[in-house]
């Protein structure tokens, strides 16, 4: 006996209760492939999730995160609260980066400043909670009489920090 279910297109399901007739997916459900015996329940975007694409009879809804949150995981399976630059999300909420660390994004963790001396360089611009240090030429390159193929970068104006 031929399986009539294979003829059922996406957006329908094969209704065994009705002699394998192809029935449309009920409201708030979908089938993305043909030959399905059931339709899947549509994803609901609620709370910190907002709808990016409505559910249709042939495709699931897609969610995004509301303002102040960003997606984590495949297909935005989680929403994580944003923090400010210079902060990280901890078990007590958003906390400032500890001295010697920085975060230049609204997400992720605080990372240690670059250790310029490991590369034999000196600190040209100090680090902040929001920005990594900027490494400059090595101290030897800055000693009197040392020649350099390229002139050193001009000093930053006082009172101006990197944006």
């Amino acid at each position: 006996l031929q399986d009539l279910c294979s003829n059922c297109p996406a957006g329908t399901f094969c209704d065994n209760n009705r002699s394998q007739i192809c029935s449309p997916c009920p409201p708030n459900s979908f089938s993305s492939a043909g030959g399905q015996r059931t339709c899947d329940i549509c994803r609901q975007c609620k709370g910190v999730f907002k709808t990016r694409k409505e559910c249709s009879s042939t495709s699931n809804a897609e969610c995004d995160c509301i303002s102040g949150y960003h997606c984590l995981g495949a297909e935005c399976s989680m929403c994580e609260q944003d923090c400010k630059q210079g902060q990280e999300l901890t078990k007590k909420g958003c906390k400032d980066c500890c001295f010697g660390t920085f975060n230049d994004q609204k997400r992720g963790i605080c990372r240690p400043w670059t250790n310029c001396s490991l590369d034999g360089k000196s600190v040209l611009v100090n680090g902040t909670k929001e920005r990594d240090v900027v490494c400059g030429p090595s101290p030897a390159d800055l000693s009197p009489g040392a020649s350099s193929a390229t002139p050193p970068a001009p000093a930053r104006e006082p009172g101006h920090s990197p944006q």
């Epitope: 709370g47 999730f49 969610c63 609260q81 999300l89 901890t90 909420g93």
Partner: nanobody, 122 residues
Framework: EVDLVESGGGLVQPGGSLRLSCAVS????????MSWARQAPGKEFEWVSS???????YYVDSVKGRFTISRDNAKNTVYLQMSSLKPEDTAVYYC????????????????WGQGTQVTVSS
């Protein structure tokens, strides 16, 4: 069917107190971590407090010492006792399940209540 129903919101003067309740049905409450979150007018949605199934609690700094989250597993209810209320606490307060157990992170499978309005004004 899972249901979360908040109650206890209202208008209160600065310095006053309110106790929000969230009655839960349709899943095993005693095994579930729960959270409160809020959204003030024109502001972004903010995590407020969370409680693990074992009773361990977390709070955002701005409410620490003023708000207390608690749960009654026999009544399938989570509470938020709010005292020393300030005008900046004015918001819609939402109760939600908390599957990730990570502060400020919610999962797509979490359940949410409809919210209860809290207004702090003289």
């Amino acid at each position: 069917e899972v249901d979360l129903v908040e109650s206890g919101g209202g208008l209160v003067q600065p310095g006053g107190s309110l106790r929000l309740s969230c009655a839960v049905s349709g899943f095993t409450f005693s095994n579930s971590a729960m959270s409160w979150a809020r959204q003030a007018p024109g502001k972004e949605f903010e995590w407020v407090s969370s409680i693990y199934s074992d009773g361990k609690t977390y709070y955002v700094d701005s409410v620490k010492g003023r708000f207390t989250i608690s749960r009654d597993n026999a009544k399938n209810t989570v509470y938020l006792q709010m005292s020393s209320l300030k005008p900046e606490d004015t918001a819609v307060y939402y109760c939600a399940t908390w599957k990730t157990l990570r502060v400020g992170v919610w999962d797509e499978s979490d359940y949410w209540g409809q919210g209860t309005q809290v207004t702090v004004s003289s």
